[in-house]
């Protein structure tokens, strides 16, 4: 159920997940002179039973000044899947995740984290796209993505989302800003039945969001 | 399934204007920003620009802007781009082109051949 | 604007044999390079995204490779059908570039 692949790159775009999948794990990586204490957990893990989700295990850093070396963490042979990392700029300010069941919000942060957060996303996870600073939509269909399982594989839909430097863009006067349309691809173009996700409480989730989330830049 | 059906081929004068058409079917046209590329034997594959077919911002080739101009008309899912002031020079196939998600072209029009020739 | 060198600009290969376009950037691309492969009268194909992500449809006998400045197309075993002109194309920054082209034909 982990997906096998990172979510799409856009140019001059980060993601960002809004809530994290039931199954959903991430990385504890300390930053570089710390390391996992000894006994510390190598992930937390989103879990959770009807009514409510959290992550369990926590991260713990150490300092590793007492070891001659200061290596960063490396995964576990379960983990070595492609992993999507995402940098920490600041702190982060969760939306209300009370309506979405089934998920997690974002983990807090712990003591001498590194600046990259590496998770393993599962099926059904969505994230959510926008153009970095100095640059804006030049065109924004579906910009969002959704991890599916299709005929066994797991691949991300694709976001529609073209971003330009702020200079280079040509607007028709009286144009409307865009805003991400709820669809996904249309069923004409796919081959055959992708498993079901929770694709409407989260574009209704979508729809009420405003950009000031995207707190945290993913690269 | 997804087609994009481009305007016929056009002779025409030098000087003058001429329109292609570029007509989207099988998806929600205005997910997906369309693009225009230039094929002369010249110069191989060129990138003219794109527009979004959302609501019509443009992005252009700084060596096509004033020869090409893109527009959309949502309510017939089509997008035009017509070429100003021909000379023999922009003759060549001029291909539309749907963009897709983290990769420019997934799916392209037959091409419209243009010759200007007096 | 990002200038791509592609090369060689034609070449001649064997039924079977592995073959290997490349593309220079004039800086780094941070890998959105694209391929594309187009016959006699048609439209352009992509064949590969990202650098190295095969478009879905495309026989895996095509592969991508190369990050910052430095790509490669690599045909591992060619057939027949493989002929025609194989393009490369930035899409980091606007404008878009693609290379000159590279002529492919079975000897």
């Known amino acids: 159920e982990l997906c096998d692949d990172d979510p799409p790159e856009i140019p001059h775009a980060t993601f960002k997940a809004m809530a994290y999948k039931e199954g959903t794990m991430l990385n504890c990586e300390c930053k570089r002179g710390f390391r996992r204490i000894k006994s510390g957990s190598l992930y937390m893990l989103c879990t959770g039973n009807s009514s409510h989700s959290s992550w369990d295990n926590q991260c713990q850093c150490t300092s590793s000044a007492t070891r001659n070396t200061t290596k960063q963490v490396t995964p576990q042979p379960e983990e070595q899947k492609e992993r999507k990392t995402t940098e920490m700029q600041s702190p982060m300010q969760p939306v209300d995740q009370a309506s979405l069941p089934g998920h997690c919000r974002e983990p807090p942060p712990w003591e001498n984290e590194a600046t990259e957060r590496i998770y393993h996303f599962v099926v059904g996870q969505m994230v959510y796209y926008q153009c970095v600073q100095g640059y804006r939509a030049l065109h924004r269909g579906p910009a969002e993505s959704v991890c599916k399982m299709t005929h066994g594989k797991t691949r991300w839909t694709q976001p529609q989302l073209i971003c330009t430097g702020e200079m280079e863009t040509s607007q028709f006067p009286g144009e409307e800003k865009p805003q991400a349309s709820p669809e996904g691809r249309p069923e004409s173009e796919t081959s055959c039945l992708v498993t079901t996700t929770d694709f409407q409480i989260q574009t209704e989730m979508a729809a009420t969001m405003e950009t000031s989330i995207f707190t945290t830049e993913y690269q | 399934q997804v087609q994009l059906q481009q305007s016929g081929p056009e002779l025409v004068r030098p000087g003058v204007s001429v329109k292609i058409s570029c007509k989207g079917s099988g998806y929600t046209f205005t997910d997906y920003a369309m693009h225009w590329v230039k094929q002369s034997h010249a110069k191989s594959l060129e990138w003219i620009g794109v527009i979004s077919t959302y609501n019509g911002n443009t992005n252009y080739n700084q060596k096509f802007k004033g020869k090409a101009t893109m527009t959309v008309d949502k309510s017939s899912s089509t997008a035009y781009m017509e070429l100003a002031r021909l000379t023999s020079e922009d003759s060549a196939i001029y291909y539309c082109?749907?963009?897709?998600?983290?990769?420019?072209?997934?799916?392209w029009g037959q091409g419209t051949t243009l010759t200007v020739s007096s | 604007d990002i200038k791509m060198t592609q090369s060689p600009s034609s070449m001649y290969a064997s039924l079977g044999e592995r073959v290997t376009i490349t593309c220079k950037a004039s800086q780094d691309i941070n890998s959105y390079l694209s391929w594309f492969q187009q016959k006699p009268g048609k439209s352009p194909k992509t064949l590969i995204y990202r650098a190295n992500r095969l478009v879905d449809g495309v026989p895996s006998r095509f592969s991508g490779s190369g990050s910052g400045q430095d790509y490669s197309l690599t045909i591992s075993s060619l057939e027949y059908e493989d002929m025609g002109i194989y393009y490369c194309l930035q899409y980091d920054e606007f404008p878009y570039t693609f290379g000159g082209g590279t002529k492919l034909e079975i000897k």
């Open positions: 082109a749907r963009s897709y998600g983290n990769y420019p072209f997934d799916y």
